[in-house]
């Protein structure tokens, strides 16, 4: 049985330009201790979209649902979507360390942007 599951329930999300996009992610446990980060793309060239501890992400808001009893919600909302935001977004769990160690990624959610 896996110790940690990172679940991105939607394979794809389509949003009109100018609207907001909600990207859902739940994690089965806070243990191991460490942050959740959101990235666009995979591999060494991926772009950090949201990191709670560091950086400034004015268009990104956490929209967790704290009432979820059986898992932890780390969903985000990206406002004022433009075509440049299209891509696949990954919710990634890290284990705290020096530096933090990537443990597990969600399967990814592809964001497509429709014309207004």
């Amino acid at each position: 049985e896996e110790e940690l599951q990172v679940i991105q329930p939607e394979k794809s999300v389509s949003v009109a330009a100018g609207d907001s996009a909600t990207l859902n992610c739940t994690v089965s446990s806070l243990i191991p201790v460490g942050p959740i980060q959101w990235f666009r793309g995979a591999g060494p060239g991926r772009e950090l979209i949201y990191n709670l501890k560091e950086g400034h992400f004015p268009r990104v808001t956490p929209v967790s649902d704290p009432t979820k009893r059986n898992n932890m919600d780390f969903s985000i909302r990206i406002s004022n979507i433009t075509p440049a935001d299209a891509g696949t977004y990954y919710c990634v769990k890290f284990r705290k360390g020096s530096p933090d160690v990537e443990l597990k990624s969600g399967a990814g959610t592809e964001l497509s942007v429709r014309a207004k």
Epitope: L30, I31, I36, M72
Partner: antibody, heavy 118, light 112 residues
């Protein structure tokens, strides 16, 4: 019904060792993060140790790190706390607690008393 | 370490009235829009029992006269109306990702 039953407490001299056990039933033990929390009249509740559902990750406060070791046997639905180099300040009631998400302590056992005294 | 300061240390409230307990954290316990603050009830001779998880969520089976509120560093547990069986000591607990996890010193609730 969730049940957590601690055992192994007792009187031990300073510098001695004890092994506490917690027998779990009524839930899927292997899916739960497990912890020990202790309670003393003077210091109230104090988190002692936590282990991930599969046993890979363990966490301790500085007050017990290097002296206490937490382990689990998911096949036996059991949790163990090996306590070495015991000190008078380790005297407390030790509770076993379960947590599905590793956030709050959802269920607690009745506790087992550890007394460290010469 | 994140220090949790509960006030008052003890509280006497008339049956049917409101009891309010405060817990202040030395730094924020919020992560990703969720407050990792929890409340427990402990009656004499018994282990603690979870009442409220993540600041404001009522644990299953807990009467709805218990409620929790707050965010970041300031949290409140409210019992309204107070019943005789609510006589107990109440503890707050934080489980943010900054170890160690800590508890407040407790608030003893009695009947006036």
């Amino acid at each position: 019904e969730v049940q957590l039953v601690e055992s192994g407490g007792g009187l031990v001299k300073p510098g001695g060792s004890l092994r506490l056990s917690c027998a779990a039933s009524g839930f899927t033990f292997s899916s739960y993060v497990m912890s020990w929390v202790r309670q003393t009249p003077g210091k109230g509740l104090e988190w002692v140790a936590t282990i991930s559902s599969g046993g890979t990750y363990t966490y301790y406060p500085s007050s017990v790190k290097g002296r206490f070791t937490l382990s689990r046997d998911n096949a036996k639905n059991s949790l163990y706390l090996q306590m070495n180099s015991l000190r008078a300040e380790d005297t407390a009631v030790y509770y076993c607690a379960s947590s599905l998400t590793g956030s709050s302590f959802d269920y607690w056992g009745q506790g087992t008393t550890v007394t460290v005294s010469s | 370490d994140i220090v949790l300061t509960q006030s008052p240390a003890s509280l006497a409230v008339s049956l049917g009235e409101r009891a309010t307990i405060s817990c202040r954290a030395s730094e924020s316990v919020d992560l990703y829009g969720t407050s990792f603050m929890h409340w427990y009830q402990q009656k004499p001779g018994q282990p603690p029992k979870l009442l409220i998880y993540r600041a404001s969520n009522l644990e299953s089976g807990v009467p709805d006269r218990f409620s929790g509120s707050g965010s970041r560093t300031d949290f409140t547990l409210t019992i309204n109306p107070l019943q005789a069986e609510d006589v107990a000591t109440y503890y707050c607990h934080q489980s943010s990702d900054e170890l160690p996890w800590t508890f407040g010193g407790g608030t003893k609730v009695e009947i006036k």
